[in-house]
């Protein structure tokens, strides 16, 4: 059966300078694969969060995903601030070279509400 | 720079036991999976176990299950491997090995020989 | 279990390709260790199939496709002479494997 991305909340919200966690757990590890997150779709999504390396300011993830059976692959977003408004995925790749999107999350907007 | 030293190794009778250390430096230690590797004389590499970065999750090689455990304290950057009931068959050169992402292995250390030996 | 050819040859300067089998696409990752003296630390020089640590030579590269990865030493030099041992790990199982090495001679 072929691997799903779950993000279970459509949308959060949060307020200027507050954190924020947006949710995703997978039903499989396989095929083997980096997951990523995205603001937004398409040619002009931005990478907000690789799990594949650690310098992310802001971002870190929720749980301990070197745990080799780890399926949960949420991210905190600390500091929020206007300009991380927007909808969120949760992508998973099967590796190649390049890797190749095999799976995306329904997606989570943020709304960030005036402190 | 990423540095890994292991130490603890020496030579014990069979059925006795040892602790190996491996003191890291130049990483943020608690944000990665490690594990311990062994050489013996004249063969080639052998995985024996994995942690990951909180030490929650353990991982290990059928041969050690049971007798060896591995474990790290991150408020001291340092990994360990308990191995008890010691063979002859546990005669190597043991190294820790700092884990990619994706489980395999981007640094080594130096290794430390472990002869048992009666 | 990962196999790998006992031994290759090459002259300096050409084209050295070392092939480990025994791995399956969908849930294996596979890296490439060098070990230039028996029991001196091995040094990865490919991990992630592909991926080469920032401080080893851009001569050393990898691919993986099917059940097999490849190491390949573009315009081999003496000092690259050594065992290379091709690494798996298996998202199935959670456990890493190695090929038995390669002897790389430098003629």
């Known amino acids: 059966t072929e691997v799903k991305v779950i993000q279970p909340e459509k949308s959060v919200s949060v307020a200027a300078g507050d954190s924020t966690v947006l949710n995703c757990t997978l039903t499989s590890l396989l095929p083997v694969g980096p997951i990523r997150w995205y603001r937004g779709v398409g040619q002009s999504r931005q990478l907000i969060y690789s799990f594949t390396t650690e310098h992310f300011p802001r971002v870190t993830n929720v749980s301990d995903a070197t745990k080799r059976s780890n399926l949960d692959f949420s991210i905190r977003i600390s500091n929020v601030t206007p300009e991380d408004a927007g909808t969120y995925y949760c992508v998973k790749f099967q590796r190649g070279s390049p890797d190749t999107e095999i799976q995306s999350g329904g997606g989570t907007e943020v709304y960030v509400l005036a402190k | 720079d990423v540095q890994l030293v292991e130490s603890g190794g020496g030579v014990v009778r069979p059925g006795e036991s040892l602790r190996l250390s491996c003191a890291a430096s130049?990483?943020?230690?608690?944000?990665?999976?490690m594990s311990w590797v062994r050489q013996a004389p004249g063969k080639g590499l052998e995985w024996l176990a994995g942690?990951?970065?909180?030490?929650?999750?353990?991982y290990y090689i059928d041969s050690v299950k049971g007798r060896f455990t591995i474990s790290r304290d991150n408020s001291k950057n340092s990994l360990y491997l308990q191995m008890n009931s010691l063979t002859a068959e546990d005669t190597a050169v043991y190294y820790c090995?700092?884990?990619?992402?994706?489980?395999?292995?981007?640094?080594w250390g130096l290794g430390t020989l472990v002869t048992v030996s009666s | 279990a990962l196999t790998q050819p006992a031994s290759v040859s090459a002259n300096p300067g050409e084209t050295v390709k070392i092939t480990c089998s025994g791995g399956?696409?969908?849930?294996?990752?596979y890296g490439w260790y060098q070990q230039k003296s028996p029991g001196s630390a091995p040094v990865t020089v490919i991990h992630s199939d592909d991926k080469r640590p920032s401080d080893i030579p851009s001569r050393f590269s990898g691919s993986a496709s099917g059940s097999a990865a490849t190491l390949t030493i573009t315009g081999v030099r003496v000092e690259d002479e050594a065992v290379y041992f091709c690494?798996?790990?298996?998202?199935?199982?959670?456990?890493?494997?190695f090929g038995a090495g390669t002897t790389l001679t430098v003629l």
């Open positions: 942690i990951s970065a909180g030490g929650s999750d353990t």
């Open positions: 690494g798996a790990y298996d998202g199935r199982t959670y456990i890493n494997t």
């Open positions: 090995a700092r884990e990619t992402w994706n489980h395999l292995f981007d640094y």
């Open positions: 130049g990483f943020t230690f608690s944000s990665y999976a």
């Open positions: 399956d696409y969908y849930s294996t990752y």
